[in-house]
Interface confidence: medium
């Protein structure tokens, strides 16, 4: 359990031309108030997602009325801190959203009108119990200066406020400068504040304001190496006569804190104080910058010069994701038309077209008759992978441009003679046959077994192919 605290120092026009003179509209005076919203993690949260870690609203600030000739000021702010209590563990990484709202006090129907003036979003890492962190943010033409911190409450301790201690005044041998927690908790309270300047590495205290030295160090602040130690030869945690401590092997031996973190002992455990940019139990975690090469597959990294500022990867063709880590399945967009098969070759896409289609994306229909006229009265027929002309009688070839001999194929059966005619061909049938192609035999009594000849044509007369 604990509380996140936000102190707004100033809100006013940012530097540069075009900065607004007043937060108020022309309708009259206004006053400001602030809303803070906390979301866990460092992910890009949608603006409307809930403030899962909590939210708080400030009081209304003093009424502001624009002075026409006065320079644009920092605006009057609400008094006090904005406090967001948290019941569970402090997550360490969070998104901080600060909204500046304007309350217009003109003669509005239905009371004051509210409007959002500025909104800043920061993704941050912050250990509970640390010092105030200061920040300056711009939102459009406005500039906001603020400080924030997270602190533990209700006897919670640690960088996440997860360790609960109940004070106990009985003396102990918990370790340098640490007192044990209540019997139910195998943890320690925060150490007392030692004398100002007492060496962090070589001194410790069991009571506030004192500074006791580890073996090999001396002086009021334990900063002077001792040439001879009065503790030599002693074993055990302390000597009543000398006040020296001869530490046995402790959890900080070998310094488990990575990246230059400094270690302080807790009973049976340790705690790391991490340098800027590092966090985690052993200071083993840091933010990512462009120097880390976070953009894969040839992506270009932009921004992100320090761990607190974001970087962006510009991905080469064929890759996507925040770090260009995902190969784009370009075929999933189905770029090949008309049932073509898509092949992603890495450097390029290729479409394998079905018969009758062509082009980079199979977009051309080879059967398309548009613009492909058939000459001499022929008609274009689609199908078969290429346009085809059905030619009028007497013409042939791909486009019906060639003259054709209609009798070349010997169309008249049973020895009938073929005559070319302007509209086609005519068969003169041998005796005993009839029909447009002399295909029907004639009975001796002159009656056909198949449909009779049209009126006016006797069996054996030449019949024209209509």
């Amino acid at each position: 359990a604990g509380v996140f605290e936000l102190q707004i120092h100033s809100f006013g026009p940012g530097p540069g031309p075009g900065a607004p003179r007043s937060p108020c509209s022309a309708r009259g005076p206004c006053r400001l108030f602030f809303r803070v919203c906390l979301k866990p993690g460092l992910s890009e949260e949608a603006a409307e997602s809930p403030c899962a870690l909590g939210a708080a609203l400030s009081a209304r600030g003093p009424v502001y009325t624009e002075q026409p000739e006065a320079p644009a000021p920092d605006l009057p702010l609400p008094n006090g801190l904005l406090q967001v209590p948290f019941r569970d563990a402090w997550p360490g990484t969070f998104s901080l959203i600060i909204e500046t709202w304007r309350e217009e006090l003109g003669d509005q129907i239905g009371g004051p009108a509210w409007s959002l003036l500025a909104r800043v979003t920061r993704r941050r890492r912050l250990a509970a119990g640390g010092p105030w962190a200061r920040d300056i943010q711009r939102a459009g033409a406005w500039e906001l200066r603020f400080s924030y911190r997270a602190r533990c409450e209700l006897l919670a301790v640690g960088t996440a406020c997860t360790r609960l201690c109940r004070p106990r005044s009985a003396p102990s041998r918990c370790g340098p400068g640490l007192r044990p927690c209540a019997p139910l908790e195998d943890e320690c309270e925060a150490p007392p504040v030692c004398r100002a300047g007492c060496s962090l590495e070589h001194g410790f205290c069991e009571q506030p304001g004192e500074c006791r030295c580890l073996e090999g160090w001396t002086g009021p602040l334990c900063t002077v190496p001792a040439s001879t130690s009065s503790c030599l030869g002693l074993r055990g945690p302390s000597s009543a006569t000398t006040g020296c401590l001869v530490p046995g092997p402790g959890p900080c031996d070998g310094n488990p804190c990575a990246n230059g973190g400094s270690c302080s002992e807790t009973p049976g455990s340790f705690e790391c104080t991490c340098p800027r940019g590092f966090y985690g139990l052993r200071c083993e975690v840091s933010g990512v910058t462009c120097a880390d090469g976070p953009c894969f597959n040839g992506g270009l990294c932009v921004g992100g010069a320090d761990p607190d500022s974001a970087y962006i990867c510009h991905c080469p063709p064929g890759f996507q994701g925040s770090n260009c880590e995902k190969r784009v399945d370009r075929c999933s967009l189905q770029p090949c038309r008309n049932g073509g098969l898509c092949l992603d070759l890495g450097h390029a896409l290729r479409c394998r077209c079905r018969a009758g289609f062509a082009g980079p994306r199979c977009e051309h229909n080879l059967d398309d008759c548009a613009g492909r006229a058939c000459a001499n009265g022929g008609t274009c027929v689609e199908g078969g992978g290429a346009h085809r002309c059905s030619c009028a009688l007497g013409f042939g070839g791909r486009d019906c441009r060639e003259r054709a001999d209609p009798c070349a194929a010997r169309p008249c059966a049973h020895g009938g003679r073929c005559y070319a005619h302007f509209s086609g061909l005519v068969c003169a049938c041998a005796p005993g046959y009839m029909g447009s192609r002399c295909e029907f035999p004639v009975h001796p009594d002159g009656v056909s077994a198949l449909p009779a000849a049209p009126p006016g044509l006797r069996p054996g007369d030449p019949q024209r192919y209509l």
Epitope: L42, S286, G287, V288, D292, P294, N297, G321, E325
Partner: nanobody, 117 residues
Amino acid sequence: QVQLKESGGGSIQAGGSLRLSCAASGVSYNRCSMGWYRQAPGKGRELVSRIQPGGNTYYADSVKGRFTVSQDNAKNTVSLQMNSLKPEDTAMYYCNALCWRENVNYWGQGTQVTVSS
């Protein structure tokens, strides 16, 4: 919880070889990229090599052709084979996991490499 533990450092003559190994636990290889950094006394930390998802590798210009990074996902290890070592390779070498889902780097404790001429 991601934990990285380096081994294989030591002292060696110039021209010799060393193989650094990093035991990685809690690392999801499909969202983390493993790498090696080094920090010489009084200097900043520099990226030596990185093995990206899919097996692409990156090397700093100063180590190209001499160092080789490899990853064994089954054994949860990443290794750095260092050949033709030079005195300027003397540094503390750190194993690293860059995990972009959380947008953080995880670091090992480091292993010292000292190359004498």
